[in-house]
């Protein structure tokens, strides 16, 4: 018996073939013995089958001896032992439609697990292996599940089913919904305006929901909601805003929050969470801000970070042109009286300056003793 | 039976393009990915990337992307790699393979393309 | 991209011996790795996947064990057909990559 597998929704081309290539009387039947179709002359004719609607041959194709059973927008339950009847002769093919389906969504926020289900024909033991975006392979009997979902999860999925040695192969997109980066960290001189953006990692026709800036600023001991919001089919609209710091929100997407200045109060962390309409759980970005500040008191010159900084990343003062006076992997440098000219405090990773300021030293010039 | 058979052996000169071919047959061709691997003289295989001929969807290797493009044409059951400017380095052997979920299962005879001034 | 280190790098061996080869993977892979018998001049041809399993036509004195990091080919009775190069290949992300190879040889 011929096996045929099929792919809910899809349409199948069952064969039938005569020896003579020429039209001729035939029928197809399903196991219960219901005629679903045949011909009568050059006329097609339809029996009492529930295939009714949805079944069809090709015409063109029976002068050459060929009696195809086209079945449209198959249903797992069409799944069934099909005969065709010629020249005295019973053809049998056995047709096992599937379907594979994503857990009720298949825009999934980062974090969430996605649930693959098979529908399968009673008697069918299909085995499933999928194969996401990045190339990773998963394996199993009528459900899938993959926990955590990444970023790089999203895009289409190459599904497998296997059945009698025969395949059939499914394609479902995923949208992973997420932030571009997890984190980001932006630097800034004391005095600066401080740009935060937020991009989104999806693109959805419709966006609804709300998001919230909370931030823990280094000096302070608890954090503190910075601005809340509303986002309507892609507008941004702000709820509440603090008075210090008064940040401004760009009204279009990628969300983007505008800080007036980097002070050292506001140096710290923050976390915007994002509640998209219709999906539990949020989206999150951290952001960090990292002000720095170069000062002379009287025969001091000083240069401090304030803010979330690695202990790797070395704070420098140096002269223009000439090598460090001092270089430190702490958060705070100074000179003693230094030299007139421009300085310069650098905030540098492995060589690389991730924050410079200068400040200008000016020559002291020693008054006359008077007599 | 289950058969790719590739293009015949090409020999080219450094800056010219040149496009390389594997018919499948046999099986569904649109259901399945299909691979290019190469080996140069002496050296062992390695993964350049896929396609998928129902929707020329392709995943290339970082090693290979911007070097060659992977194309399919489904009408006719036949993948294709090419380079819009050889190298000498590009001398090898090319071979397409059915990619069941990752693995290989049948491989084309091969593609030997030389490149030399 | 994950690394697969095969050893020996070349093998001599005689008829009627069991010969074992190993690939390691610079990181788990689970069961997704593949076998594969290279002749001079010809394509390769697929012997195990999933680790373990035996591809349709295959002998069945090639047999493939390992998941995680750590996998073996073995065959357990050397035969004249299979003196050739092996390779392994993980199929569990992208870029799905090869061993460097193992020759094995007639002593």
């Known amino acids: 018996k011929k096996v045929v597998l099929g792919k809910k929704g899809d349409t199948v081309e069952l064969t039938c073939t005569a020896s003579q290539k020429k039209s001729i009387q035939f029928h197809w039947k399903n196991s219960n013995q219901i005629k679903i179709l045949g011909n009568q002359g050059s006329f097609l004719t339809k029996g009492p089958s529930k295939l009714n609607d949805r079944a069809d041959s090709r015409r063109s194709l029976w002068d050459q001896g060929n009696f195809p059973l086209i079945i449209k927008n198959l249903k797992i339950e069409d799944s069934d032992t099909y005969i065709c009847e010629v020249e005295d002769q019973k053809e049998e093919v056995q047709l096992l439609v599937f379907g594979l389906t994503a857990n009720s969504d298949t825009h999934l926020l980062q974090g969430q697990s996605l649930t693959l289900t098979l529908e399968s024909p009673p008697g069918s033991s299909p085995s499933v292996q999928c194969r996401s975006p990045r190339g990773k392979n998963i394996q199993g009997g009528k459900t899938l599940s993959v926990s955590q979902l990444e970023l790089q999860d999203s895009g289409t999925w190459t599904c497998t089913v296997l059945q009698n040695q025969k395949k059939v192969e499914f394609k479902i997109d995923i949208v992973v919904l997420a932030f571009q980066k997890a984190s980001s960290i932006v630097y800034k001189k004391e005095g600066e305006q401080v740009e935060f953006s937020f991009p989104l990692a999806f693109t959805v026709e419709k966006l609804t929901g709300s998001g919230e800036l909370w931030w823990q600023a280094e000096r302070a001991s608890s954090s503190k909601s910075w601005i809340t919001f509303d986002l309507k089919n892609k507008e941004v609209s702000v709820k509440r805003v603090t008075q210090d710091p008064k940040l401004q929100m760009g009204k279009k997407l990628p969300l983007h929050l505008t800080l007036p200045q980097a002070l050292p109060q506001y140096a710290g962390s923050g976390n915007l969470t994002l509640a998209l309409e219709a999906k539990t759980g949020k989206l999150h970005q951290e952001v960090n801000l990292v002000v720095m500040r170069a000062t002379q008191l009287q025969k001091n010159l000083t240069c401090e970070v304030w803010g979330p900084t690695s202990p790797k990343l070395m704070l420098s003062l140096k002269l223009e042109n000439k090598e460090a006076k001092v270089s430190k992997r702490e958060k705070a440098v100074w000179v003693l009286n230094p030299e007139a000219g421009m300085w310069q405090c650098l905030l540098s990773d492995s060589g690389q300056v991730l924050l410079e300021s200068n400040i200008k030293v000016l020559p002291t010039w020693s008054t006359p003793v008077q007599p | 039976e289950v058969q790719l058979v590739q293009s015949g052996a090409e020999v080219k000169k450094p800056g010219e393009s040149l496009k390389i071919s594997c018919k499948g047959s046999g099986y569904s061709f649109t259901g399945y990915w299909i691979g290019w691997v190469r080996q140069m003289p002496g050296k062992g295989l390695e993964w350049m990337g896929i396609?998928?001929?129902?929707?020329?969807?392709?995943t290339y290797s970082p090693s290979f992307q911007g070097q060659v493009t992977i194309s399919a044409d489904k009408s006719i059951s036949t993948a294709y790699l090419q380079w819009s400017s050889l190298k000498a380095s590009d001398t090898a052997m090319y071979y397409c393979?059915?990619?069941?979920?990752?693995?290989?299962?049948?491989w084309g005879q091969g593609t030997l393309v030389t490149v030399s001034s | 991209d994950i690394q697969m280190t095969q050893s020996p790098s070349s093998l001599s061996a005689s008829v009627g011996d069991r010969v074992t080869i190993t690939c390691r993977a610079s990181q788990g892979i689970s069961s997704w790795l593949a076998w594969y018998q290279q002749k001079p001049e010809k394509a390769p041809k697929s012997l195990i996947y999933s680790a373990s399993s035996l591809q349709s036509g295959v002998p069945s004195r090639f047999s493939g064990s390992g998941s995680g990091t750590d996998f073996t080919l073995t065959i357990s009775s050397l035969q004249p057909e299979d003196f050739a190069t092996y390779y392994c290949?993980?199929?569990?992300?992208?870029?799905?990559?090869f061993g460097q190879g193992t020759k094995l040889e007639i002593k």
């Open positions: 396609i998928y001929p129902g929707d020329s969807d392709t």
């Open positions: 393979a059915r990619d069941q979920l990752g693995l290989f299962d049948y």
């Open positions: 290949q993980q199929y569990d992300s992208y870029p799905y990559t």
